[in-house]
């Protein structure tokens, strides 16, 4: 990896698990410079592989609310608005980092956790399994 | 929101900015219980709205490497393998949390940051703007 010169103004850590345990400021900085007003908002409905969004809530997690996509059909919507089963709708998944309260119910102590979320769906050509 | 009873075994925080600054264990727990062997691995190529993945690296961020999807075409791939410009390939974006070293170059002090990433692409019916 890239070696970073240490800033002399860094806070000191007395934690015996250092550098495993770090200090994190929860005052979120939003770097979304994207000013495009048309984001993924209505793609779920206009897609040829449409999906629904389901609210996943967990008070022991930060962020506590995550939206999960579920593809509406196994096939894809064709030009006539019907489902075409010669094509497959599949979820696009991403591994994201969240904070899990640890020990449980603690307001100021967390552990990083990796979870797999489904963000939306895409239409793919099926894999054809040839029988020998 | 849901009120969580505080665990008496929680670590104490002397930080003057508490509860804005919290302790986070970076020993990642992987909660991906999904045993589905077929994940999004080859969807980028098989999709009717195919995409390429670009590596975005930033040593001041955790995770330092994030993969960004960029749609290959403005249109979508039709049954003949040609690009159909009557349909649009669009990126599916998601806001994710990352940790930003703050102050810069500090190994044990971070600030939560929200960034918008493109995870993949989907094929949508275009919005038709009727001229009055």
């Amino acid at each position: 990896g890239i070696t970073i010169p240490r800033n002399p103004g860094c806070p000191n850590s007395e934690d015996k698990n250092f550098p495993r345990t770090v200090m994190v400021n929860l005052n979120i900085h939003n770097r979304n410079t994207n000013t495009n007003p048309k984001r993924s908002s209505d793609y779920y409905n206009r897609s040829t592989s449409p999906w629904n969004l389901h609210r996943n809530e967990d008070p022991e997690r930060y962020p506590s609310v995550i939206w999960e996509a579920k593809c509406r059909h196994l096939g894809c919507i064709n030009a006539d608005g019907n489902v075409d089963y010669h094509m497959n709708s599949v979820p696009i998944q991403q591994e994201i980092l969240v904070l899990r309260r640890e020990p449980p119910h603690c307001p100021n102590s967390f552990r990083l956790e990796k979870i797999l979320v489904s963000v939306g769906c895409t239409c793919v050509t099926p894999i054809v399994h040839h029988v020998a | 929101g849901i009120t969580i009873p505080r665990n008496p075994g929680c670590p104490n925080s002397e930080d003057k900015n508490f509860p804005r600054t919290v302790m986070v264990n970076l020993n990642i727990h992987n909660r991906n219980t999904n045993t589905n062997p077929k994940r999004s691995s080859d969807y980028y190529n098989r999709s009717t709205s195919p995409w390429n993945l670009h590596r975005n690296e930033d040593p001041e961020r955790y995770p330092s490497v994030i993969w960004e999807a960029k749609c290959r075409h403005l249109g979508c791939i039709n049954a003949d393998g040609n690009v159909d410009y009557h349909m649009n390939s669009v990126p599916i974006q998601q806001e994710i949390l990352v940790l930003r070293r703050e102050p810069p170059h500090c190994p044990n002090s971070f600030r939560l940051e929200k960034i918008l990433v493109s995870v993949g692409c989907t094929c949508v019916t275009p919005i038709v703007h009727h001229v009055a």
């Epitope: 449409p50 389901h54 509406r72 089963y85 | -």
Partner: antibody, heavy 124, light 113 residues
């Protein structure tokens, strides 16, 4: 516990609109989708349509021009409207909850909880 | 529409004995992306609404006794009851949830001999 209860008139005149309500309790509306299914006397089950958690709908093409499914989340109620009915629409009408599976990334069209059903007779 | 054909349509059974119902689909119910078969079994007891027994061909719904088991793939599926009990009487339906509209078999009536 999970409960679904259908209600509405038991008798509808031909060419009129059949209107039924399904009141639900014991589960989260934002998570689950609800289907309507019917069963003509002495016959099998026929899926009419679904309303997804976000309010979108999908209908059996056999009913498409006549059917509307809607939701009133404030009342925990779903409704089915079937227009231009004939004697062939006489049936027991069920509302049913579509199964929700957490780590599964498709909508589910298996029904894991059903109402008790309501008989609607179409006759003049 | 996908046609689901069950056999037999009537099945007289003896308590304690096994029973088997067949369901055939006019098209394959196997989804290539996840290798799941989109087939379910329901039981409608006399005077009641249907209840889900099995989904994805062989996954038992919670609370369903383990004497019920499902098998098959593609277009041919089977529901087996290892030892029939008196409470198992009713009409059994298979249902496909791959293709819209989601269709049911015509039903198999299981009754005690």
């Amino acid at each position: 516990q999970v409960q679904l209860q259908e209600s509405g008139p038991g008798l509808v005149k031909p060419s009129e609109t059949l209107s039924l309500t399904c009141t639900v309790s014991g589960f989260s509306l934002p998570s689950h989708s609800v289907s309507w299914i019917r069963q003509p006397p002495g016959k099998g089950l026929e899926w009419i349509g679904i309303i997804w958690n976000q309010g979108g709908t999908d209908y059996n093409s056999a009913f498409k021009s006549r059917v509307t499914i809607s939701v009133d989340t404030s009342k925990n109620q779903f409704s089915l409207k079937l227009s231009s009915v004939t004697a062939a629409d006489t049936a027991v009408y069920y509302c049913a909850r579509n199964m929700y599976i957490t780590d599964y990334y498709y909508e589910n069209y298996f029904m894991d909880a059903w109402g008790q059903g309501t008989l609607v007779t179409v006759s003049s | 529409d996908i046609v689901m054909t069950q056999s037999p349509l009537s099945l007289p059974v003896t308590p304690g004995e096994p029973a088997s119902i067949s369901c055939k689909s006019s098209q394959s119910l196997l989804f290539s992306e996840n290798q799941k078969n989109y087939l379910a079994w329901y039981l409608q007891k006399p005077g009641q609404s249907p209840q889900l027994l099995i989904y994805w061909t062989s996954t038992r719904q919670s609370g369903v006794p383990d004497r019920f088991s499902g098998s098959g793939s593609g277009t041919d599926f089977t529901l087996k009851i290892s030892r029939v009990e008196a409470e198992d009487v009713g009409v059994y339906y298979c249902q496909q949830s791959y293709y819209t509209p989601y269709t049911f078999g015509q039903g198999t009536k299981v009754e005690i001999k």
